[in-house]
């Protein structure tokens, strides 16, 4: 997260760290007791690593009573996701067992009504992604509030040049932005999950390159079918 600040500890009990061989790779969001939603591209570089999900964490390194690492039983990328586009960049991870819920571990309601979030709405994005262009990684969860940007502006030739589909949304990226390592994490508007940070190699913190988020409401049928 660029231009953000440390989050209040455990105030985002839905927040997940998707890890490979014990290292944070991407964000994720607990959407059901045994399921975490993230971005499909996140695992492309997981290779033969052990994929796990950390729940109930604020610090990645320090012991915390609520922290627990879960093995992944099944990784389900969206069937239309592919390596060379950010379209359909969603991944569902089934935990090896139901998460132990509590004040620091709780699923987040996700948007089912397929309607664009009003431009200008302030939404919260959180993650353990890099906090500087030099690539410094935080130990503790960071967050930032970002205004939603209308699709027409986001699709301008000077911005994302038509790449933003109806199934994506944008947020402003003027020095405050999601960045590498935040992919798969939640964009939360009004206490509801609206978007998932896409995992392209986009430049961060440049206002001409807004943050791109996959709209979960557009994938309600798929999410329901996997969780069923």
């Amino acid at each position: 997260i660029l231009g953000g600040r440390e989050a209040e500890a455990h105030a985002r009990p839905y927040m997940a760290s998707v890890q490979v061989n014990g290292e944070h790779l991407c964000g994720g969001v607990l959407v059901a007791e045994q399921w975490v939603l993230s971005a499909a591209h996140c695992l492309e570089d997981a290779a033969d690593g052990k994929v796990q999900v950390l729940l109930g964490a604020h610090s990645l390194s320090q012991p915390e009573p609520s922290k627990r690492l879960y093995d992944v039983l099944r990784a389900v990328p969206h069937p239309d996701s592919r390596p060379d586009t950010i379209d359909h960049d969603l991944l569902l991870l089934q935990l090896s067992e139901k998460a132990t819920l509590g004040p620091a571990v709780r699923p987040l309601p996700w948007q089912r009504v397929d309607r664009d979030v009003e431009p200008g709405t302030l939404c919260d994005v959180a993650g353990w992604g890099i906090v500087s262009h030099a690539g410094r990684r935080p130990d503790r969860l960071q967050h930032v509030l970002l205004p939603v940007l209308d699709r027409a502006t986001c699709n301008r030739r000077t911005h994302h040049d038509g790449a933003i589909t109806q199934r994506m949304m944008c947020a402003e990226s003027n020095r405050r932005d999601s960045c590498k390592g935040d992919s798969g994490g939640p964009l939360v508007c009004g206490g509801v999950l609206e978007g998932v940070v896409t995992s392209g190699s986009r430049v961060c913190g440049n206002r001409k390159k807004p943050g791109i988020y996959t709209r979960v409401a557009s994938y309600a049928a798929w999410i329901d079918s996997v969780l069923a």
Epitope: N21, L43, E44, D45, A46, A47, D48, G49, K50, L73, R74, A75, V76, P77, P79
Partner: antibody, heavy 120, light 112 residues
Framework: EVQLVESGGGLVQPKGSLKLSCAAS????????MNWVRQAPGKGLEWVAR??????????YYADSVKDRFTISRDDSESMLYLQMNNLKTEDTAMYYC???????????WGTGTTVTVSS | DVLMTQTPLSLPVSLGDQASISCRSS???????????LEWYLQKPGQSPKLLIY???NRFSGVPDRFSGSGSGTDFTLKISRVEAEDLGVYYC?????????FGGGTKLEIK
């Protein structure tokens, strides 16, 4: 650039031995599972062996046709993959490819191959 | 072992035509993790094989959208909507759900 380069092929007599090598570059070799796939002259592809990464205890798997005769191994410090072939048979004559194994998919990067000929 | 049977063995086509290759497995290739590891590879003359389709229907990087994969259980199909000269070669299906992993016998796509 991601690259796999095989070496060590050649002519060997039946019941003889040969060790194939594969030099990997351009990616984090130690995190990937690796495979050997072969192709007999004018024939189709046949998976031979797979070795997983350290995080999966270097687990190995083999095709029934080579079990107990071939051994797959790796040296992560040198980014090298090996195939030790013992008790070779004429039916082992083939082009041997070193192949990287992805997460969502299997064989995403292939070497150019090295030829093994088993003949008396 | 899972036997992968491809048909036809040879497929003569005219450029611009649609081509369809079938692959049938001797048993279900749904993995214990719920995914179906069915892939398609193309080997052009004198070259190493290249991955086209993974998990039944997902196109790999750089693969044109004229290639599509479908199927489930034991029956799978690769379709090329408009064959181009660069598509000629031998197509192989592959299952990675059960060890030992197995390839189909191959289908040679050639000009009519």
């Amino acid at each position: 650039e991601v690259q796999l380069v095989e070496s060590g092929g050649g002519l060997v007599q039946p019941k003889g031995s040969l060790k194939l090598s594969c030099a990997a570059s351009g990616f984090s070799f130690n995190t990937y599972a690796m495979n050997w796939v072969r192709q007999a002259p004018g024939k189709g592809l046949e998976w031979v062996a797979r070795i997983r990464s350290k995080s999966n205890n270097y687990a190995t798997y083999y095709a029934d046709s080579v079990k107990d005769r071939f051994t797959i191994s790796r040296d992560d410090s040198e980014s090298m993959l090996y195939l030790q072939m013992n008790n070779l048979k004429t039916e082992d004559t083939a082009m041997y490819y070193c192949v990287r194994h992805g997460y969502y998919w299997y064989f995403d990067v292939w070497g150019t191959g090295t030829t093994v000929t088993v003949s008396s | 072992d899972v036997l992968m049977t491809q048909t036809p063995l040879s497929l003569p086509v005219s450029l611009g035509d649609q081509a369809s290759i079938s692959c049938r497995s001797s048993q279900s290739i749904v993995h214990s993790d719920g995914n179906t590891y069915l892939e398609w590879y193309l080997q052009k003359p004198g070259q190493s094989p290249k991955l086209l389709i993974y998990r039944v229907s997902n196109r790999f990087s750089g693969v044109p959208d004229r290639f599509s994969g479908s199927g489930s259980g034991t029956d799978f199909t690769l379709k090329i909507s408009r064959v181009e000269a660069e598509d000629l070669g031998v197509y192989y299906c592959f299952q990675g759900s059960h060890v030992p992993y197995t390839f189909g016998g191959g289908t040679k796509l050639e000009i009519k």
